[in-house]
Amino acid sequence: EEELQVIQPDKSVLVAAGETATLRCTATSLIPVGPIQWFRGAGPGRELIYNQKEGHFPRVTTVSDLTKRNNMDFSIRIGNITPADAGTYYCVKFRKGSPDDVEFKSGAGTELSVRAKPSAPVVSGPAARATPQHTVSFTCESHGFSPRDITLKWFKNGNELSDFQTNVDPVGESVSYSIHSTAKVVLTREDVHSQVICEVAHVTLQGDPLRGTANLSETIRVPPTLEVTQQPVRAENQVNVTCQVRKFYPQRLQLTWLENGNVSRTETASTVTENKDGTYNWMSWLLVNVSAHRDDVKLTCQVEHDGQPAVSKSHDLKVSAHPKEQGSNTAAENTGSNERNIY
């Protein structure tokens, strides 16, 4: 009779993480008598995966009933596969011996490869806000995928970006891989509502890529433009001076009125109006009693926006002549009710 051969028909098996791997093995003869064992690895350091005779192997089940006398199918199933299970698995026939069984013949081995999905991409932006026209970097990271081949794309508001660098680690073979990409984005004044998207495509995702997003509202700072104007109000001796603070983001803003360099009033932007592009407008006014002044008055609107150095705009109030209208209020979308009489 021909000598027993151990047949492992599959040179390789590819299984998705979390699924069950079937490792096939058949013997060509019932003789010699003795058990089958499955190992990962072929050398002295090999790991026992299944022993027909004894042991505890909670993740392993046999495909057929090994207790049947004429059984020659020694295939096994390994449940809940993870990337750490990758390796070469050998079906080994032992010959019954005393006191110990003796290794008789091994199959050629089956390489188990594990497909693992990438984690949801995490996009992070710069630690500090930046202003329009500046270039900022965004990073995207995804981990735990296998095989190594992966595609990463960057988008800003649906438009694909080209200025980015991507690395997949490790360089060599591994049970699982990570991807890290850095994209450069030029900010514009209209970017408050913009989004940066990192898109990862992998064989395990079956054409449905994973996306990570970052809102540029977390990154951008649009500094305000200031306009100080004056109109006559109520009685002829009163002048309304307004400071229109336009197109700023984020909302955090503090305004100080200075009269001839002295602090007159400080207030925090509260009732702001939002523009279509996501920036804000705000207006503060000051009611000045001109009759109380002999000399001209220099009124300064000083704005500290989002912790940045203050910007200011001044207006010279002529008290010698009859006050005339020196501006209009058409750009203000909201009026405050802040009054200040100067006595």
Epitope: Q37, F39, R40, G41, A42, G43, P44, G45, R46, E47, L48, I49, N51, G55, H56, F57, G87, T88, V92, F94, P99, D100, D101, E103, G109, E111, P170, V171, G172, E173, S174
Partner: antibody, heavy 118, light 114 residues
Framework: EVMLVESGGGLVKPGGSLKLTCAAS????????MSWVRQTPEKRLEWVAT????????YYLDSVKGRFTVSRDNAKNTLYLQMSSLRSEDTAMYYC???????????WGQGTLVTVSA | DIVMTQSPSSLAMSIGQKVTMNCKSS????????????LAWYQQKPGQSPKLLIY???TRESGVPDRFIGSGSGTDFTLTISSVQAEDLANYFC??????????FGGGTKLEIK
């Protein structure tokens, strides 16, 4: 968590004997090959012996064959190294290691020092 | 026996620098059946036992920082630390883990931090 704790080291005269013990926990002991690796005073690492998984297969460095015996008690999750006819060149820190599945050493104990000196 | 030779025997680097150390085997560690190179790298910090970093020449062990990169094939192998950190002060050993016994180690490379 994989834990390997060696014991039994000490000072012994040339020609003497010593038995090292490695208590293992945190994994299915019987499913893994277990090894002894030593580190000489010059910091060189040297594989000494391995007890395979799934049978009674033992493997030895040529210079310790016939003098050292590796054994295991799967019920007690313990690996042993019986050393006899000790020589001065056996002086080393002896580490117990759980082998990876294809010949590397995945986990190491803290070691036990064996000094062979007259 | 397969002889493993490491170079340099020691090197001193500043934090943040890229570190490269080499390991050469006296015969090929490439298994033609599975195209894997049977080489491992270990880190041994002062007063501690060795710790596995890499096996099959480039497969990083779980939990090992990705600044440790193994490369090479056949008889020539490299361990690269892309940006060395203070905690990387250690001896680094290579080991051939081919089925052919005895398994052998290189003499080590001592990494010192400037």
């Amino acid at each position: 968590e994989v834990m390997l704790v060696e014991s039994g080291g000490g000072l012994v005269k040339p020609g003497g004997s010593l038995k090292l013990t490695c208590a293992a926990s945190g994994f299915t002991f019987s499913n893994h090959a277990m090894s002894w690796v030593r580190q000489t005073p010059e910091k060189r690492l040297e594989w000494v012996a391995t007890f395979g998984s799934g049978g009674s297969y033992t493997y030895y460095l040529d210079s310790v064959k016939g003098r050292f015996t590796v054994s295991r008690d799967n019920a007690k999750n313990t690996l042993y190294l019986q050393m006899s006819s000790l020589r001065s060149e056996d002086t080393a820190m002896y580490y117990c290691s759980r082998s990876g599945w294809d010949g590397w050493f995945a986990y190491w104990g803290q070691g036990t020092l064996v000094t062979v000196s007259a | 026996d397969i002889v493993m030779t490491q170079s340099p025997s020691s090197l001193a680097m500043s934090i943040g620098q890229k570190v490269t150390m080499n390991c050469k085997s006296s015969q090929s560690l490439l298994n033609s059946n599975n195209q894997k190179n049977y080489l491992a790298w270990y880190q041994q910090k002062p007063g501690q036992s060795p710790k596995l970093l890499i096996y099959f020449a480039s497969t990083r062990e779980s939990g090992v920082p990705d600044r440790f990169i193994g490369s090479g094939s056949g008889t020539d192998f490299t361990l690269t630390i892309s940006s060395v950190q203070a905690e990387d002060l250690a001896n680094y050993f290579c080991q051939q883990h081919y089925s052919t016994l005895p398994w052998t180690f290189g003499g080590g490379t001592k990494l010192e931090i400037k």
